[in-house]
């Protein structure tokens, strides 16, 4: 056959799906590899094609679309599962083509079992709730596309193993699950089960993530330098090594880039011929605020080093600090000599 | 050395004509990122230098022009503060096939490029030029069949071949070509397309079609009640879901609590060909929260939204 | 017959927006491009915008680009123009007009008056 | 963008005279031109495209010629009727423009 645009496969879409559970898969060739999409290609006679390779096999074949009631059915750009089979896992390929034109896109689909408490090897999607902020919702995700506006499905949400039910500060809402005021002891994993029916046959689709409580935006603050600070002095003799801990704390911020950075007169570390190493360490508190040390060491400092000026920069969504070190050349004791 | 391939990008080139391919994979490259362009797995990166022939220009591999011997697979890397990922792109060169008219004619590229016409319409074909900013592209010039098109059913426009009436002896082979500057040196490039020509067809395929809303936005007062349609056209046997959504829930979900946004019960109109479809969504009051959110139609594949604007000042 | 009408003209005020309308009849709409052009009371005629038959290819004069959006719906054999931030030198008749050789217009509509004033 | 500019504005003719109308462009546009005639309170109508190919239903009295810049409309004998304002325009780039206008008015 002539030549198609493989793109190989696509390990980007790590696709995981439940055993016994619909699945309606779109094909990526469209969402991410080919300028047009699935409309204009089909308008201009181009024929969208599926198979697949089981797992720990070679040998692609077509996908058998013939399977009573219609376990596994293509419509538009989307594979549909009613329901999966977990000796379904296996590399899927997308191929469009024509006479003239060919393009083809695989990618991994694993289908995953899951426990009677929902748990399973599934990649759980994280969603950060600000702690006491306020009502919050979180929704049951990617169940688009699976039944008509007309269909009302039942959602059934639970933490952990346990059905939500009179919580206090919990409340099921239909495809959303509102947190009255979000504390740390709501962290952990939530799963809403939606239930729905289609041509007599019912379908559960179970949907779980995990929240984690973290800092709100009310209480954050720009970058607080807690070493160096005025009451410590780094006072070294030459030949001593010389260390100073740059420790930074950052309140939490959504999406924020938490940068901490020393410069030695002026300049960056890299810059400069000293030899200087820097060592970070990074620890967070349960509402993912972080404190970031770096620690500036120069193995045998030089008078000359004990003259520089050393600051430690930070910097996040909420602003820019910096601070000096207290450096200085130790004076030696004076020696009494006895005439 | 820890980076994930991600996957491989076959291209067939001519020689002794510019090229150049850009990296990006966008749920990667929208971030902050950098990339590095190496060939056939060499430690050593593509050069920066904008007077090599072959160059790295921000995220693009250039080259001015591409040579027979330049075939081989390039590898970007593009790394981001905890990442690493690999895209291949395996370049084939092949020598030009000159036309048979003569020696000076234009190369005879077959695969490079197919595009369609449409039968009776007016309709237009397209060269696809893709460069970095440092290319100049000259205006463009189209040919067929190894003759420069001239005529009154053709216009140039942009990178656009305009065709008005296409009739059936409009298929064939095209070649659009333009001068590229770059650095004050000129080179050619020339794209071949093949063109087919498509029949009268009736209602065209079976995605559905949004014809309102257009992606546009709606100037609304504050407080007020809003009824906007989605209309859309689709095949008689669809199964297509039509419905509102925003922030990708549906509308009815979203504003569950309050019910202040609700869909409305879907209607059609049967054509001979097709149905059209009305579902509107009601704003019982625009509240302040709602300026600048798409609110979104789908239809099946095809989405189309509205953003709701406040109404320019009224300084009388 | 060949005909175009316009609709939804009127009087608006700077800053705000209007949609115009153009339904066409007498020919099949979805072979040809259609294009908007305007004519200030007592001017020439100013080209504003064009849009394929497949809404492929659109086109706008400067003076209202980014302003202005042209759509149409085959389905209802309808032309469309969304004009955003309207100012007083809009301030215009406007036609619409089926292409011909895609960018010449063999059939006007009467046009629809379009006034921008506060 | 190609600026058209039409001469005269204004032509003062009888009825049976020979009337010469002169479009020029401001770069070539190949023979990408048409002539429109406007009465009014009345919308353009298409005369003449692509320099000199007559419209449906236009008399054999209208003709045009030219190509590159320099583009004429004649009208050989005037009627009654072909007393109103006559326009250029191009279609050989984006923008398409339009020339400002020739009134042809009874002398």
């Known amino acids: 056959s002539e030549r198609c645009d493989d793109w190989g496969l696509d390990t980007m879409r790590q696709i995981q799906v439940f055993e016994d559970e619909p699945a309606r898969i779109k094909c990526p060739l469209f969402e991410h590899f080919l300028k047009f999409n699935y409309s204009t290609a089909h308008s201009a006679g181009l024929t969208l094609i599926w198979y697949w390779t089981r797992q720990d096999r070679d040998l692609e074949e077509p996908i058998n679309f013939r399977l009573p009631e219609n376990r596994i059915s293509k419509e538009k750009d989307v594979l549909w599962f009613r329901p999966t089979l977990l000796n379904d896992t296996g590399n899927y390929t997308c191929m469009l083509r024509n006479t003239t034109y060919c393009s083809k896109v695989a990618f991994p689909l694993e289908v995953v079992q899951k426990d009677s408490c929902f748990n399973s090897p599934m990649k759980l999607p994280v969603h950060k709730l600000y702690i006491e902020y306020g009502i919050q919702r979180i929704t049951c995700p990617n169940v688009d596309g699976y039944f008509p506006s007309s269909v009302k499905p039942t959602i059934t949400w639970y933490m952990g193993c346990y059905k939500i039910q009179n919580f206090n500060n919990v409340i099921p809402e239909g495809m959303n699950l509102s947190f009255l005021i979000a504390l740390i002891s709501n962290n952990g994993n939530y799963t809403c089960v939606v239930t729905y029916p289609e041509n007599g046959r019912t379908f559960h689709l179970t949907r779980t993530l995990t929240v984690k409580v973290v800092g709100s935006p009310k209480n954050a603050v720009p970058p607080v330098i807690h070493s160096p600070n005025d009451h410590v002095v780094y006072e070294k003799e030459p030949g001593e090594e010389l260390l100073i801990p740059c420790t930074v704390y950052f309140s939490f911020l959504m999406d924020s880039r938490n940068e901490v950075w020393w410069t030695i007169d002026g300049k960056k570390p890299d810059d400069i011929t000293i030899d200087v190493t820097i060592n970070e360490s990074i620890s967070h508190s349960r509402t993912e605020d972080e404190t970031r040390t770096q620690i500036l060491s120069i193995k045998k400092v030089t008078s000359e080093d004990l003259k520089r000026s050393y600051v430690c920069h930070a910097r996040s969504a909420k602003g820019e600090v910096a601070k000096a070190a207290k450096v200085k050349q130790k004076v030696p004791a004076p020696r009494y000599t006895v005439e | 050395d820890g980076c994930k391939d991600i996957f491989m990008k076959n291209e067939i080139l001519s020689a002794s004509q510019p090229f150049a391919f850009n990296c990006t994979f966008p749920p990667i490259t929208s971030g902050e990122v950098s990339v590095t362009w190496y060939k056939n797995s060499s430690k050593i990166p593509v050069s920066k230098i904008i007077q090599s022939r072959i160059h790295q220009d921000e995220t693009w591999i250039l080259f001015l022009p591409m040579e027979w011997g330049d075939s081989g697979v390039y590898q970007c890397v593009i790394k981001g503060r905890d990442s690493c990922h690999r895209i291949h792109v395996n370049l084939t060169v092949f020598e030009k096939h000159w036309c048979d008219t003569s020696i000076g004619g234009l190369p005879n590229l077959s695969d490079e490029y197919k595009q369609i016409l449409h039968l009776g319409k007016d309709d237009s074909l397209t060269c696809h030029l893709h460069f970095p900013k440092s290319c100049v592209l000259g205006p463009i010039k189209w040919y067929k069949d190894c003759n420069e098109i001239k005529g009154e059913r053709f216009t140039v426009l942009e990178t656009r071949l305009l065709v008005s009436n296409v009739s059936a002896e409009d298929r064939g082979n095209y070649a659009c070509q333009a001068i590229l500057t770059h650095s004050g040196k000129q080179y050619e490039v020339l794209n071949g397309i093949t063109v087919s020509i498509t029949e009268r067809a009736g209602y065209g395929g079976s995605v559905p079609k949004i014809i309102y809303p257009k992606n546009h936005s709606i100037e609304v007062q504050l407080g007020t009640t809003l009824i906007v349609d989605c209309n859309v056209t689709d095949t008689k046997d669809n199964t297509n879901l039509r419905c509102w959504r925003v922030n990708n829930t549906l509308v009815d979900d979203y504003y569950d609590e309050s019910k202040r946004i609700r869909e409305g019960v879907e209607t059609h109109v049967s054509f001979r060909e097709h149905n059209l479809y009305t579902v509107n969504i009601t704003f019982l009051e625009v509240k302040m929260e709602d300026y600048g959110l798409p609110f979104m139609c789908h239809a099946g594949v095809s989405t189309a939204y509205i953003i709701l604007q406040l109404p320019a000042p009224d300084f009388r | 017959e060949v005909q175009l009408v316009e609709s939804g003209g009127g009087l608006v005020q700077p800053g705000r927006s209007l949609r115009l309308s153009c339904t066409a009849s007498?020919?099949?709409?979805?072979?040809?491009?259609i294009h908007w052009v305007r004519q200030s009371p007592g001017k020439g005629l100013e080209w504003v915008s064009v849009?394929?038959?497949?809404?492929?290819?659109?086109g706008y004069a400067d003076s209202v680009k980014g302003r202005f959006t042209i759509s149409r719906d085959n389905a209802k054999n309808s032309l469309y123009l969304q004009m955003n931030s309207l100012r007083a030198e809009d301030t215009a008749l406007y036609y619409c007009?089926?292409?011909?050789?895609?960018?010449?217009?063999?059939?006007w509509g009467q046009g629809t008056l379009v006034t921008v004033s506060s | 963008e190609i600026v058209l500019t039409q001469s005269p504005a204004t032509l003062s003719l009888s009825p049976g005279e020979r009337a010469t109308l002169s479009c020029r462009a401001s770069?070539?546009?190949?023979?990408?031109l048409a002539w429109y005639q406007q009465k009014p309170g009345q919308a353009p109508r298409l005369l003449i495209y692509?320099?000199?190919n007559r419209a449906t239903d236009i008399p054999a009295r209208f003709s045009g010629s030219g190509s590159g810049t320099d583009f004429t409309l004649t009208i050989s004998s005037l009627e009654p009727e072909d007393f109103a304002v006559y326009y250029c325009q191009q279609r050989s780039n984006w923008p398409l423009t339009f020339g400002g206008g020739t009134k042809v008015e009874i002398k």
């Open positions: 770069q070539s546009v190949s023979s990408y």
């Open positions: 849009i394929s038959w497949n809404s492929d290819v659109i």
């Open positions: 692509n320099a000199a």
């Open positions: 007009a089926k292409g011909y050789n895609w960018n010449f217009f063999d059939y």
């Open positions: 007498g020919f099949t709409f979805d072979d040809y491009a």
